[in-house]
């Protein structure tokens, strides 16, 4: 309607005696701005004055007067939007109606507002939600229509009497809509609150208690067990009998079912609150529970771990690894089911106690060959000794052991012979596949590991083998000795260091470079015939006639070995010279006749002169003097010298006879 | 029967070098599971472990002495040498050489020599 | 490295008495313990090895228990020549390690 004017506020305010009472309040006006204002008590309209009867509370007026009244009332508000009051204190008479007469320069308005003092301070609300299930988060809510801007107030939440640990989230409100306090508590309830008392209480600001509200919480849940046990420690021996009771310590709604469960599987025929086992059995060792359902759901109790007590079973060997190389770790694992844990364990070697090794585990950090073998071993406990179960093997690889080679033949071995070697070893793991030798040679192996040389050469000295599986392991070479007969043979001459002279003193020398065995025999020989068995041969004063081809013999057991032939040269000056006539010492005149000087001498003669019976040297240096034609006066006794490097030579006189011809006698 | 037999100087010097010998006999350092092992005694003190080698010459050391300690074998002599160096007199002791037991690990030093007393003094 | 405390450093004991010498471990091992009895002037003999197995030639009056860090020797009735220091040892972890020694004297 056009013709109203427009206010807004709460409709009804509420506060009790001596607090305040805050009214949030605007307004528009029909036509300009407010010029008087006035608040009445229970305002009652006068038909005959036309105006408003009632106890002023407040008034405004054009000239400013204020009555005294206004000290505890004041209008917060303004001329045109504002018409907000305050009432401070609030006294119990004020209830009722209030009345804002509002005047502008044309119109006049009579806004009603209802006011509730109650005596002392009224209670708070809680709110709860429709349904409250354990640890499910709700919001608890408690609300006061109340708040003043000059009384603060504070909600305080209890549990049972106790201020509640949550944090509560207070918020006022002081608007045209609403005038409010609230507390809201985020809270999530637990089974055992069900039932419980929770309080919003309402304090002034120094904490005094003012009013509060109270609920009982209906906190929906599964159903709480409790489980007890016979014996309570849930320890018990092979055949042994065990009680166990389920008892309900709460449940919301009432509960429907019982079962029982077993390492979390139900157990078949077991619908009463008491579970009862007889002469029970190892396998009944386990956790156990109970478990009871409502509308809400199934509620569990703690488990009771119960414990058959048994001697332990018999033990398996794990090996961490098999199989271990030679020098590896490995660790053995005796595993053994008992209750209590075993706490003695003893381990055995193929039958044989392990002395000092009586834990669960044994760590060997360096695997030897001698360690392979069977392992077993013994759990104990204090109900008993377990048995001895099969054993874990343990297999070691290493590589080939003590790899000796073997001369197969007889000794000694000979220069030629067929040697045949093996390759020998004390033990392997895994097995031998192949062998190598050294040094290499184009050598025939017959077999696996047998090594045959075919005419054994004399400086075949040692030969080693290897035997290999996965590693090769080398024996020491072993020496052949292979014997032969000597070698190298040869003349050396000693003395004297140059050529040799006729008189000279000479040494020979037989050497020979090796010989296997080392003792030999010499043989000197000229011509086939035997000269001496001395390593040297010795001439004080040689003469030309020692000049000639000469071979020594070394021998030992197994043969004998001759030099090449080694030519001994004397030098001497040219001797035995003698003049030769050709064609003989009687020549007929006018024929030809040929002298010719001879001699034994080494170097030949390099040089000749010839000499006459008077010891004229004649004018001829060559070997053989030609007379041709010879005359009578030819003859006489001839002589011839012969010179070579070492010296010279002279031969005797050797006559040339010339007789006359028969033409020559004729004539005469 | 297996015996070790201790043999080094009665008397060194500070700041020199101890070298101690270990002969053992009646059985090869060469075997297999074969391990000598040096401990000293200070005059009325307890005993302390120094150093072992084992047949495949693996060494261990005392953490304290490590950077002073060396030791080694000799297969051809049968001998286990220590060498110690900068000697002080707080190193005056008695100096056991053992052999380790090694079974199914290791074991405890099972055959002691008779000890060579050693005394650190300028 | 592993730390071994021998108690008491003393016992005084009468012949024909028992006696309880303890070891205890600075960290849990194995049982690779070892007690050796020691005379004036000899060198230590091996008693016990894997803390509680006897060496060749140890009378059985000498007993080795224990696992964790607490080991024990006892000697059930003392004779003469039992009285020494005993030494226990570990070798589990490297370096090696002897505990302080207790001297058995007669009471």
């Known amino acids: 309607d056009s013709s109203k004017w427009v206010f807004e506020h709460p409709e009804t305010l509420y506060a009790w005696e001596g607090a305040c009472v805050w009214i949030p309040c605007t307004y528009r006006a029909l036509d300009g701005d407010l010029e008087s204002f006035i608040l009445f008590h229970n305002p009652e309209y006068n038909k005959n004055t036309s105006k408003f009867d009632g106890t002023r509370l407040y008034e405004s007026t054009k000239d400013g007067k204020v009555p005294s009244e206004q000290k505890r009332v004041q209008f917060l508000g303004d001329k045109n939007k504002n018409c907000t009051l305050s009432i401070h204190p609030v006294h119990l008479n004020d209830s009722g109606q209030l009345g804002l007469r509002m005047e502008s320069k044309t119109e006049k308005w009579m806004e009603r507002i209802h006011l509730n003092v109650s005596e002392r301070p009224f209670p708070p609300h809680i709110q709860l939600p429709p349904e409250i299930q354990e640890s499910q988060e709700v919001t608890l809510t408690c609300l006061l229509n109340f708040s003043c801007y000059g009384y603060p107030i504070q909600l305080q939440w209890l549990l049972e009497g106790v201020p509640m640990r949550q944090a509560a989230v207070t918020s006022t409100s002081l608007t045209i809509k609403s005038v409010f306090t609230r507390s809201e508590l985020k809270f999530s309830p637990q089974w055992s609150h069900h039932g419980k008392i929770v309080t919003c209480q309402l304090q002034d600001a120094d904490g005094k208690f003012l009013s509060n509200d109270t609920v009982q919480l209906n906190v929906k849940h599964t159903p709480k067990l409790e489980i007890k046990v016979t014996p309570s420690d849930a320890i018990v021996r092979e055949g042994d009998s065990v009680t166990m009771t389920c008892e309900v310590s709460s449940s919301n709604p009432e509960y429907t079912t019982v079962s029982w469960l077993k390492d979390g599987t139900s157990l078949k025929k077991q619908n009463t609150f008491t579970l009862n086992l007889r002469e029970v059995t190892k396998d009944q060792s386990g956790k156990y529970c109970c478990q009871v359902s409502n509308d809400v759901g199934p509620g569990r109790s703690e488990e009771v771990f119960l414990q058959v007590q048994y001697a332990p079973e018999p033990s398996t060997v794990q090996i961490l690894h098999s199989p271990a190389v030679e020098g590896s770790q490995v660790e053995f694992l005796c595993m053994s089911l008992a209750n209590p844990l075993p706490t003695n364990y003893t381990w055995y070697h193929n039958g044989k106690e392990m002395q000092g090794r009586t834990e669960e585990k044994v760590h060997i950090p360096k695997i030897l060959p001698w360690h392979a073998g069977t392992y077993s071993c013994v759990a104990e406990n204090i109900l008993g000794t377990g048995q001895r179960g099969p054993g874990a093997e343990l297999d070691v690889q290493y590589p080939p052991k003590k790899v000796t080679t073997v001369i197969q033949n007889p000794m000694p071995i000979r220069e030629g012979d067929t040697v045949t070697l093996s390759c020998n070893y004390n033990s392997s793991n895994p097995s031998v596949t192949r062998y190598e030798w050294k040094p290499h040679g184009a050598w025939e192996e017959p077999s696996l590991g047998v090594l045959k040389i075919q005419n054994v050469g004399w400086d075949n000295t040692t030969i080693a083998c290897a035997a290999c599986n996965s590693w090769c392991s080398w024996a020491s070479p072993v020496a052949l000795n292979v014997q032969y007969a000597p070698r190298d043979v040869r003349v050396r001459k000693i003395k004297p260091l140059s050529e040799i002279h006729s008189g000279n003193s000479v040494s020979l020398q037989c050497d020979f470079s090796s010989s296997h065995p080392k003792e030999v025999q010499f043989f000197w020989e000229k011509n086939g015939r035997l000269l001496g068995k001395e390593s040297q041969l010795n001439f004080d004063s040689i003469s030309p006639e020692d000049a000639g081809s000469y071979s020594c013999w070394v021998n030992n057991s197994i043969g004998q070995t001759a030099s090449k032939a080694w030519t001994l040269e004397v030098l001497y000056a040219p001797r035995r010279l003698r003049v030769s006539m050709s064609p003989g010492d009687q020549v007929m005149e006018g024929k030809s006749a040929t002298l010719t000087c001879e001699s034994d001498a080494n170097p030949p003669v390099s040089h000749y002169t010839w000499f006459d019976w008077n010891n004229q040297s004649l004018p001829y240096h060559s070997q053989k003097l030609r007379l041709e034609p010879v005359k009578v006066q030819h003859s006489g006794a001839y002589w011839c010298q012969g010179t070579n490097s070492v010296g010279k030579g002279r031969s005797p006189l050797s006559t040339l006879t010339v007789y006359y011809s028969p033409e020559t006698i004729g004539r005469r | 029967q297996v015996t070790l037999r201790e043999s080094g100087p009665a008397l060194v010097k500070p700041t020199q070098t101890l070298t101690l010998t270990c002969t053992l006999s009646?059985?090869?350092?060469?075997?297999?599971?074969?391990?000598v092992t040096w401990i000293r005694q200070p005059p009325g003190k307890a005993l302390e472990w120094l150093a072992l080698?084992?047949?495949?010459?693996?060494?261990y050391y005392s953490t304290s002495l490590k950077t002073r300690l060396t030791i080694s074998k000799d297969t051809s002599k049968n001998q286990v040498v220590l060498t110690m160096t900068n000697m002080d007199p707080v190193d005056t002791a008695t100096y056991y050489c053992?052999?380790?037991?090694?079974?199914?690990?290791?074991?405890?030093?099972?055959?002691w020599g008779q000890g060579t007393m050693v005394t650190v003094s300028s | 490295e592993v730390v071994m405390t021998q108690s008491p450093a003393t016992l005084s004991v009468s012949p024909g008495e028992g006696a309880t010498l303890s070891c205890r471990a600075s960290?849990?091992?194995?049982?690779?313990i070892a007690w050796y009895q020691q005379k004036p002037g000899q060198a230590p003999r091996l008693l016990i090895f894997?803390?509680?197995a006897r060496a060749t030639g140890i009378p059985a009056r000498f007993t080795g228990s224990g696992s964790g860090t607490e080991f024990t020797l006892t000697i059930s009735s003392l004779q003469s020549e039992d009285f020494a220091v005993y030494y226990c040892?570990?070798?589990?972890?490297?370096?090696?390690?002897f505990g302080g020694g207790t001297k058995v004297e007669i009471k």
């Open positions: 960290q849990s091992g194995s049982r690779n």
């Open positions: 894997g803390a509680s």
């Open positions: 009646g059985l090869p350092l060469s075997t297999s599971g074969m391990a």
């Open positions: 053992a052999r380790m037991g090694y079974s199914y690990g290791w074991d405890a030093f099972d055959l």
């Open positions: 080698i084992d047949w495949d010459d693996d060494k």
């Open positions: 040892q570990q070798y589990n972890n490297w370096p090696l390690t």
